[in-house]
């Protein structure tokens, strides 16, 4: 908003200066299309360019996209940040065998020590699992008696980490996901008991299940394994992650193991109506950017007129027909009124359905 | 950070009148677009109205001729007058700034202030 400006001589005659009355001092001015990296830039330097969504601001003042962490056995440890990149990780029980660049190109399960053996360090996301011998009674490197008790009879003891990425991927090729669901079928055959129940082979219960993986005795990381594009909910259940498939949306954040793909629309346009975690109706945003100055009354409560540029003019604004009606091929509820001077109807036309599930924010 | 308080809600009678209250506060120099949504019980957020800096306003087609949205930059305030409320007005409203960035997910509905309840019943 246009503030009072009390102090405001100390910027006077300096266009590209103005008052900032929260912090009481002159902020420079960033130039059009750049923003400021902090509340009362003082300088150019304090200005940045901005980015399209996903991507971040690298140091040779480049806009690279941020790495995505959509592999099923990867999770976000960091967000795509204005100036940095989006930050991979092995999901919980697995490390990384071959990193890469804010990723990871090779996930291994964390192994199970074997008998005799007990834990001395558990698995990170960077370091598999180091084992110890077994000392007599329970040993303090154990975070309970359960860690530390030799596997039933029967069992065969995981010697080496259980890959869940083919072994020919590499930091800069991503795994097919039907690959590596197989590779993860392949090892949980490996690594279960051969009398023990499997869920290999077996129909899934749950949509977008697949086998669960061996479970270290006790360790706390044994989870479903869901399908490709699916995600564990809260409630415990395989659920398809939304899809941004339709023109007029892109993609905000992953689909990742525990939570679903979100959507938003796509620049330059507006969400009318929200669906969880998406929008069900985007719509070309109505404003124009303004070239022209509000009339000298204060923006009064009421009945105030405004001078407007005419619709039109700016590159991203839609122009309004002559007469003020929408086309009689838009809906009702995807116009939007402007109110200048005289109102008219500006259509706003959508490849979205109306009819899209909007349960949540 | 940027704030908003949503006040001026309550409950009224179809037909009746209510004027919402958003006030503003982190801005730095000429405050940007500001927008009004709103959430039924069980939808979806929905876009009521946006109003520019320099005063321009957009009404959705349901609201239009019974809302207007206004602000006064000398109060940090916008507002929303709420005329002939009808029983589907019933819902949280929130306003939210900056709309052409920030709205274009599903997720401008809450985000910067509580909202205030509006209840349409006889």
């Known amino acids: 908003f246009p503030q009072d400006r009390p102090f405001e001589d100390t910027c006077h005659g300096n266009p590209s200066h103005y008052y900032d009355k929260a912090v009481r001092r002159c902020c420079y001015r960033c130039p059009m299309g750049l923003f400021p990296t902090q509340q009362c830039p003082q300088r150019p330097t304090d200005c940045r360019k901005q980015c399209e969504p996903d991507y971040y601001l690298d140091e040779a003042d480049r806009c690279t996209a941020c790495v995505t962490c959509s592999r099923d056995d990867l999770v976000e440890k960091t967000p795509c940040a204005w100036n940095s990149s989006r930050v991979c990780e092995c999901r919980p029980g697995m490390f990384c065998s071959t990193s890469a660049v804010n990723s990871c190109a090779r996930c291994f399960f964390h192994s199970v020590c074997p008998a005799g053996m007990i834990v001395k360090f558990p698995g990170t996301a960077q370091k598999n699992t180091v084992c110890e011998p077994a000392s007599p009674g329970v040993s303090p490197a154990c975070a309970s008696p359960e860690n530390c008790k030799e596997p039933s009879s029967g069992t065969i003891p995981q010697a080496k980490p259980t890959p869940v990425s083919p072994a020919t991927s590499s930091a800069s090729t991503m795994p097919v996901r039907g690959g590596t669901r197989l590779a993860q079928e392949a090892a949980s055959k490996l690594t279960r008991a051969p009398d023990s129940p499997s869920s290999v082979g077996r129909p899934s219960s749950d949509p977008g299940l697949s086998p669960t993986q061996p479970c270290p005795e006790g360790s706390g990381d044994c989870r479903k394994q869901c399908e490709p594009d699916y995600y564990l909910d809260e409630a415990g259940r395989c659920t398809a992650c939304v899809s941004c498939s339709r023109d007029d949306l892109v993609e905000k954040t992953p689909c990742a193991w525990n939570s679903s793909r979100t959507c938003e629309c796509r620049p330059g346009m507006i969400c009318a109506t929200s669906a969880t975690n998406s929008c069900a109706r985007c719509v070309p945003y109505p404003i124009c950017a303004a070239e022209t100055v509000t009339k000298p009354q204060d923006m009064a409560e009421k009945d105030t007129t405004f001078e407007a540029p005419p619709l039109g003019t700016q590159p991203d604004c839609n122009p309004t027909p002559e007469n003020g009606e929408a086309p009689a091929s838009t809906s009702p509820t995807q116009s939007l009124l402007v109110d200048s001077q005289a109102s008219k109807t500006l259509p706003i036309p959508t490849s979205a359905p109306v009819a899209l599930s909007s349960t949540g924010k | 950070e940027v704030q908003l308080v949503e006040s001026g809600g309550g409950l009224v009678q179809p037909g009746g009148s209510l004027r919402l209250s958003c006030a503003a506060s982190?801005?730095?120099?000429?405050?940007?677009?500001m927008a009004w949504y709103r959430q039924a019980p069980g939808k979806g957020c929905e876009l009521v109205s946006i109003?520019?800096?320099?005063?321009?306003?957009y009404y959705t087609d349901s609201v239009k001729g019974r809302f207007t949205i206004s602000r006064d930059n000398s109060k940090n305030t916008v507002y929303l007058q709420m005329n002939s409320l009808r029983a589907e007005d019933t819902a949280v409203y929130y306003c939210?700034?900056?709309?052409?960035?920030?709205?274009?997910?599903?997720?401008?509905?809450?985000?910067w202030g509580q909202g205030t309840t509006v209840t349409v019943s006889s």
């Open positions: 982190g801005f730095t120099d000429d405050g940007p677009d």
């Open positions: 109003i520019s800096a320099d005063g321009r306003t």
């Open positions: 939210a700034p900056d709309p052409r960035r920030n709205c274009r997910g599903g997720d401008c509905c809450g985000n």
